[in-house]
């Protein structure tokens, strides 16, 4: 990129710069038209026959460098050929000198600084590749010369350039000062700004375009050289923010439309709101869910919006005695998740009606909770209570949803309990062919004991068919027909309206060998 | 020697016509911009029109624009004025002017008058 | 576009300094012509480019131009210049050229 400094081409008003010194055949001004028929204005000389050692300067005003450390001049001119001349000397010359001159500010005067090399630098002796040829009577013809010099390195505010005649018939036709910059340029969607190099390379800090963050890495730089390019590298660059899609081959980012989303910053392009979602803004980095429906704290932000999972069905359970297996199905809606889980809920009715939530003395296997199979075992019921459970289905987003959990119930009453096991059987009496037996009254729950039942065989005899029962009502029996000097393995159950309890521990009993012994009690 | 010699004017009725000639001598008409320049009658002198060496480009003052037409005729070594729609307020004397010339780019001109004709006198009356 | 203003008059003593002024805006920006105009004849070119002075000029014609205003000056000035001056300058439109209402210098 060029940025112009001064352009005679462009200067509708007279360009009138310092002549020296101040005789005739000096640097004159004229005008003319251009080819787009605008007002240019040109300079000329033609001392062909001037004096030896004279010089023509010529000094343009003062240029403020704008920054620039080199500058370059570009010089259209024509020159006439000192053979179509007559009147030119052997001191007419096809050549003419560039100088320049830095200040700080306009302090340039008629006379000052000193019209000569050092102060004024010099950048080069021009020479023209195409002369113009005058032949009398007729027009002037030839090509227009264009020269390009490169001024510098500037360190002083601004400058003035001059042009040093000694002998020439010339027109400098327009001179064009500029200097290179390296134009403002967008890549990667990094933005690197306009730079004026003050070296072969600079490097050049960018910074994100609007909506972008600077991707990981070190920062993105550029070199911007001395000729106004910007070198070629690879740039790490930045990237388009959440909710933002890069656009315009790389140089922008473009808001998320609406119903899209990009969640993170870097590449990709916006994405169509997952399931259960919308946007209703531009710029999505997240799209909302619709109601009733959610995400996990877990859950990525582009994740499918899911909803609490339906109530498990057709639970079914099989008592037996103080266990319960209860076993379900899945169900039939999951909410569009995976993380599917169980949970029960428990209430507990006594024979009397009076309802509470499940105590402790019930005992959940796996769990009552955090269930991943579809059943459980549950223990420690109690003897004629009906149960309650609630089976509820679990996901990510239950606990976020509001309102009731659906839940699949099943009532389960257990049986009244029966008497406990008889203990402590004593043997009141003995002879060699009977055994009278007592023992305590078992505490039953549901009411009294109606009667008890007798269980007794040989010991040794272990067959069915040596086993004998008695059925008494009282806590007490008289086993007879019994072997003389032989041992019997005694049980006793009690049975009350809920059934028959379990038979106690067996209990060890022996019949005397002779009647001469007589009756004796033995306590077991 | 150089000279420019006016000629063409008089006596005319407001709204008509004139054309005023100028007849350049002893220097490169062709290499030359030419202008007219008018004097009313005890006034000041007033810049009329221009006219380029190859007579692609003219300028005129507002005050002329659309009613006076400049041009030359290189061949001849001579330059016109063509008045219309005259007023009275274009009284004057006419001069031919020539422009300082280039030492040999005739596309360009020195931005003052450095030759004069004698003029002519243009009388608008009825 | 600019106007340029002169006085109307100027009066100088034989052999005195006359100086006549020539203003408008931002004018020493422009190169000022100066031309002399004598009672029946055409004008003359006197001074052009500010300060130079034409072949068959006398010296004692000399001019400046800064700030908003050129000045002709004439130097131990002579009966024989007695005329009427004018200043020109380009207009900023293209290529048009504007005159200076003119200075009578009557030389006492």
């Known amino acids: 990129l060029e940025e112009t400094l001064l352009n005679t081409k462009l200067e509708t008003a007279d360009l009138k710069w310092v002549t020296f010194p101040q005789v005739d055949g000096q640097w004159e001004e004229l005008s003319g038209l251009d080819e787009e028929q605008h007002s240019v204005r040109t300079y000329e000389v033609c001392d062909v026959q001037r004096a030896p050692g004279q010089a023509h300067w010529l000094r343009t005003g003062w240029v403020p460098r704008r920054g620039a450390v080199h500058v370059y001049a570009t010089l259209r001119f024509t020159m006439l050929e000192c053979l179509s001349l007559p009147r030119a000397g052997r001191s007419c010359k096809e050549t003419f000198t560039v100088f320049y001159y830095e200040s700080d500010a306009d302090t340039a005067t008629a006379l000052t600084p000193a019209w000569m090399e050092n102060p004024y630098i010099k950048v080069d002796t021009v020479a023209a590749e195409h002369l113009t040829r005058k032949r009398p009577g007729a027009e002037a013809t030839g090509k227009v010369n264009v020269k390009t010099l490169r001024l510098g390195p500037l360190s002083k505010a601004g400058f003035y350039l001059a042009f040093q005649d000694q002998g020439a018939c010339m027109a400098l036709l327009s001179l064009h000062l500029f200097y290179k910059k390296c134009a403002q340029l967008t890549v990667n969607l990094t933005r690197f700004p306009e730079t004026v190099p003050r070296e072969l390379v600079v490097p050049v800090a960018g910074s994100c375009v609007v909506d972008a963050v600077p991707a990981p890495g070190p920062s993105p730089s550029l070199y911007c050289r001395e000729d106004g390019q910007w070198a070629e590298q690879p740039v790490t660059g930045c990237s388009c923010a959440p909710g933002f899609e890069a656009a315009e081959g790389n140089t922008k980012c473009r808001a998320c439309a609406q119903g899209t989303f990009k969640p993170l910053s870097g590449e990709g392009s916006c994405q169509p709101c997952p399931a259960n979602s919308h946007s209703n803004t531009i710029g999505s980095a997240v799209c909302q869910c619709r109601v009733g429906y959610f995400r996990a704290r877990t859950d990525p932000r582009g994740a499918p919006c899911t909803t609490p999972p339906s109530a498990p069905r057709s639970v079914v359970s099989r008592l037996n005695g103080s266990s319960l297996h209860l076993e379900w199905s899945a169900p039939l809606e999951s909410g569009g998740r995976e993380d599917l889980t169980y949970a029960l809920r428990c209430r507990e009715c006594r024979p009397g009606g009076s309802c509470a939530p499940c105590g402790g003395d019930l005992t959940f296997d796996p769990g009552p909770r955090d269930l991943v199979e579809p059943w459980v075992v549950v223990r420690g019921l109690r003897p004629d209570f009906t149960y309650t459970f609630e089976v509820t289905a679990l996901n990510g987003v239950s606990s976020l949803a509001t309102g009731p959990v659906p839940f699949e119930p099943v009532n389960v009453t257990t049986d009244r309990e029966v008497p406990p096991a008889v203990s402590d059987i004593r043997v009141t009496r003995s002879s060699p062919s009977s055994l009278s037996l007592a023992w305590a009254v078992p505490r039953a729950p549901s009411g009294a004991v109606l009667d008890y039942e007798v269980k007794y065989h040989e010991k040794g005899a272990e067959g069915p068919s040596s086993v004998r029962f008695l059925k008494t009502s009282e806590n007490r029996a008289e086993l007879r027909g019994l072997k003389r000097g032989a041992s019997y393995l005694v049980q006793v159950r009690a049975r009350s309206e809920a059934g028959y309890g379990p038979f106690g521990q067996e209990h060890h009993s022996q019949t005397q060998l002779d009647e001469s012994e007589g009756w004796r009690e033995q306590l077991a | 020697q150089v000279q420019l010699v006016e000629s063409g004017g008089g006596l005319v009725q407001p709204g008509g016509s004139l054309r005023l000639s100028c007849a350049a001598s002893?220097?490169?008409?062709?290499?030359?911009?030419m202008s007219w320049v008018r004097q009313a009658p005890g006034k000041g002198l007033e810049w009329v029109s221009n006219?380029?060496?190859?007579?692609?480009?003219?300028g005129y003052a507002d005050s002329v624009k659309g009613r006076f037409t400049i041009s030359r005729d290189n061949s001849k070594n001579t330059l016109y004025l063509q008045m219309n729609s005259l007023r009275a307020e274009d009284t004057a004397v006419y001069y031919c002017?020539?422009?300082?010339?280039?030492?040999?780019?005739?596309?360009?001109?020195?931005?003052?008058?450095?030759?004069w004709g004698q003029g002519t006198l243009v009388t608008v009356s009825s | 576009d600019i106007e340029l203003t002169q006085p109307p008059s100027v009066s100088v003593a034989p052999g005195q300094t006359a100086r006549i002024s020539c203003s408008g805006d931002?004018?020493?920006?422009?190169?000022v012509h100066w031309y002399q105009q004598k009672p029946g004849q055409a004008p003359v070119l006197v001074i052009y480019?500010?300060?130079k002075r034409p072949s068959g000029i006398p010296e004692r014609f000399s001019g400046s131009n800064s700030g908003n205003t050129a000045t002709l000056t004439i130097s131990g000035t002579q009966a024989e210049d007695e005329a009427d001056y004018y200043c020109?300058?380009?207009?900023?439109?293209?290529?048009?050229?504007?005159f200076g209402g003119g200075t009578k210098l009557t030389v006492l």
């Open positions: 480019y500010d300060s």
């Open positions: 002893g220097f490169t008409f062709n290499n030359a911009w």
């Open positions: 931002n004018l020493g920006k422009k190169y």
């Open positions: 006219i380029n060496v190859q007579g692609d480009y003219t």
């Open positions: 002017a020539r422009k300082g010339m280039s030492f040999y780019n005739n596309k360009y001109a020195k931005s003052m008058f450095d030759l």
């Open positions: 020109s300058a380009w207009t900023t439109t293209m290529m048009h050229i504007v």
